[in-house]
């Protein structure tokens, strides 16, 4: 349902795909119950959610992960919510932390992010972790979206 | 506060209830500081929140638990946010997952869980969690709600 | 972007800034990537903010924390997102609980509060947490805000 | 396209076991999830149970929870249900539903049908 040509509903949510690439960006598909409103929204090379249009936004994700304190380095596991906008630095937005589990093989934990931010046109929004191999991609575990206001 | 009465707005935030069912499915009031806008969304058996109009929604729920490694099966507490439409299959949202504490008697922990979905009319959502007896139920500690775009 | 003169946009999201207060109540700074759409809404006295419309709003918080079992008291961290309407009672209007990590010196964890709530003309919103010194301020990791439906 | 052939239904007493079994063929890279719907004599199709072919999660109707196990076995392209403590209320024609990747919430994507199989509960 559109609010109206002028100003259409912007949503996102894609979910987590587990990736063979050693970046600690993590990868989104539109695959299962995602959503995507429209254009005004893309999911870009399966790391990024872009926007056409400024506006207040408010972005979240969510990371399930499994990790043991003695197979882990001693820093903790983090999620960072990052902004890439034209012309601009990167800025972290948002970041969670949680310790290592002492469960063995390993322990699950789930991390969740949410803010209202200002986004430019063109401005993309991206999840950053410390080690993605440690991230769960069972349904529903991982996700990353966003909603215009 | 309207946006007209074609496009009401649509939400709820509905406050945990202890249960002696032993059902997975948690139970939920509209008592304390809860929102109900108005007959476009409805508690229905205390169990689901249910939706009148087709559209885009930002669903959340938060878990509290307490729960304790030795006492408890070796699998992690999980939360599910699911959704239950006319005529199709039961689906999965949302779930987040945290390993038990070794703190005794128990130790607390929170889940938060959150996204943009598209729900059909009827569409019914509701909380599903490995272990009833181990959640929260002080003031704040476990709620649920929704709210239209 | 406006909604309309009548309808503008109302949303906030401030940065944790550290204290020498011993007050449980958090404190915010409009810095950094922060978000402060008009004069409906204002951090007031760097704790509170405070809405002049009445009005659903989504309300959040998200605090990061590091602290250890045996420094800490038995009691679990929790954090709180309490309101304080003109002339009534100051409400917990959500609560999250995570017992103490083992790690050391002291181990992160972070917690994610959200919700929507009814707020009246002058109305406050402020989070509370067992022990302020253990909150991390690093860039991201602490945020508190809302947005108007 | 999935193709969907469902087998192990028929005639069992109150308090019986029956287990089907659902095997799929085709586009199955394709699954997302599969699952079970029931429709009994003048009444809707109804839900019955569903697992999601990624990882094994499951979830039931409220009227077989605790009765009613899914399973799959990825290696032979099958689901199963075993269902248990069978009543008199289980009689009904049971279909094979399989869900196709790329069904956004925002789409109501087109389940693919197997063509039932009948369970009768009676003594």
């Known amino acids: 349902m559109q609010k109206g040509d002028q100003n259409p509903q912007i949503a996102a949510h894609v979910i987590s795909e587990a990736s063979s690439k050693t970046t600690s960006v993590l990868q989104w598909a539109e695959k299962g119950y995602y959503t995507m409103s429209n254009n005004l929204v893309t999911l870009e090379n399966g790391k990024q959610l872009t926007v056409k249009r400024q506006g207040l936004y408010y972005i979240y994700a969510q990371v399930t992960f499994c990790s043991n304190r003695e197979a882990s380095s001693q820093a903790p596991f983090i999620a960072s919510l990052c902004l890439k906008s034209p012309g601009r630095f990167e800025r972290i937005l948002l970041r969670a932390a949680n310790t290592h589990s002492s469960a063995k093989p390993c322990g699950q934990q789930s991390i969740h992010l949410g803010g209202v931010f200002e986004l430019q046109p063109g401005a993309s929004v991206f999840v950053n972790v410390t080690d993605p191999s440690q991230v769960s991609h069972g349904t529903g575990f991982t996700s990353f979206g966003l909603l215009k206001l | 506060m309207q946006k007209g009465d074609q496009n009401p707005q649509i939400a709820a935030h509905v406050i945990s209830e202890a249960s002696s069912k032993t059902t997975s499915v948690l139970q939920w009031a509209e008592k304390g500081y809860y929102t109900m806008s108005n007959n476009l969304v409805t508690l229905e058996n205390g169990k689901q929140l249910t939706v009148k109009r087709q559209g885009l929604y930002y669903i959340y729920a938060q878990v509290t638990f307490c729960s304790n490694r030795e006492a408890s099966s070796q699998a992690p507490f999980i939360a599910s946010l699911c959704l239950k439409s006319p005529g199709r299959f039961e689906r999965i949202l949302l779930r987040a997952a945290n390993t038990h504490s070794s703190a005794k008697p128990c130790g607390q922990q929170s889940i938060h869980l959150g996204g943009v979905f598209e729900l059909q009319p009827g569409a019914s959502v509701f909380v599903n969690v490995t272990d009833p007896s181990q959640v929260s139920h002080g003031t704040g500690f476990t709620s649920f709600g929704l709210l239209k775009l | 972007m406006q909604k309309g003169d009548q309808n503008p946009q109302i949303a906030a999201h401030v940065i944790s800034e550290a204290s020498s207060k011993t007050t449980s109540v958090l404190q915010w700074a409009e810095k950094g990537y922060y978000t402060m759409s008009n004069n409906l809404v204002t951090l007031e006295n760097g704790k509170q903010l405070t809405v002049k419309r009445q009005g659903l709003y989504y309300i959040y918080a998200q605090v990061t924390f590091c602290s250890n079992r045996e420094a800490s008291s038995q009691a679990p961290f929790i954090a709180s997102l309490c309101l304080k309407s003109p002339g009534r009672f100051e409400r917990i209007l959500l609560r999250a609980a995570n017992t103490h990590s083992s790690a050391k010196p002291c181990g992160q964890q972070s917690i994610h509060l959200g919700g929507v709530f009814e707020l009246q003309p002058g109305a406050s919103v402020f989070v509370n947490v067992t022990d302020p010194s253990q909150v991390s301020h690093g860039t991201g990791f602490t945020s508190f805000g809302l947005l108007k439906l | 396209e999935v193709q969907l052939v469902e087998s192990g239904g028929g005639l069992v007493q109150p308090g019986g076991s029956l287990r089907l079994s659902c095997a799929a063929s085709?586009?199955?890279?394709?699954?997302?999830?599969m699952g079970w719907f029931r429709q009994a004599p003048g009444k809707e199709r109804e839900f019955i149970a569903v697992i999601y072919w990624r990882d094994g999660s499951s979830l039931y109707a409220d009227s077989v929870k605790g009765r009613f196990t899914i399973s799959a076995d990825n290696s032979k392209n099958t689901a199963y249900l075993q269902m248990n403590s069978l009543k008199p209320e289980d009689t009904a024609v049971y279909y094979c539903?399989?869900?196709?990747?790329?069904?956004?919430?925002?789409?109501?994507?087109?389940?693919?049908w197997g063509q039932g199989t009948l369970v009768t509960v009676s003594s």
């Open positions: 539903a399989a869900e196709p990747y790329g069904s956004g919430s925002s789409l109501i994507s087109e389940y693919d």
């Open positions: 085709g586009s199955i890279d394709n699954i997302h999830a």
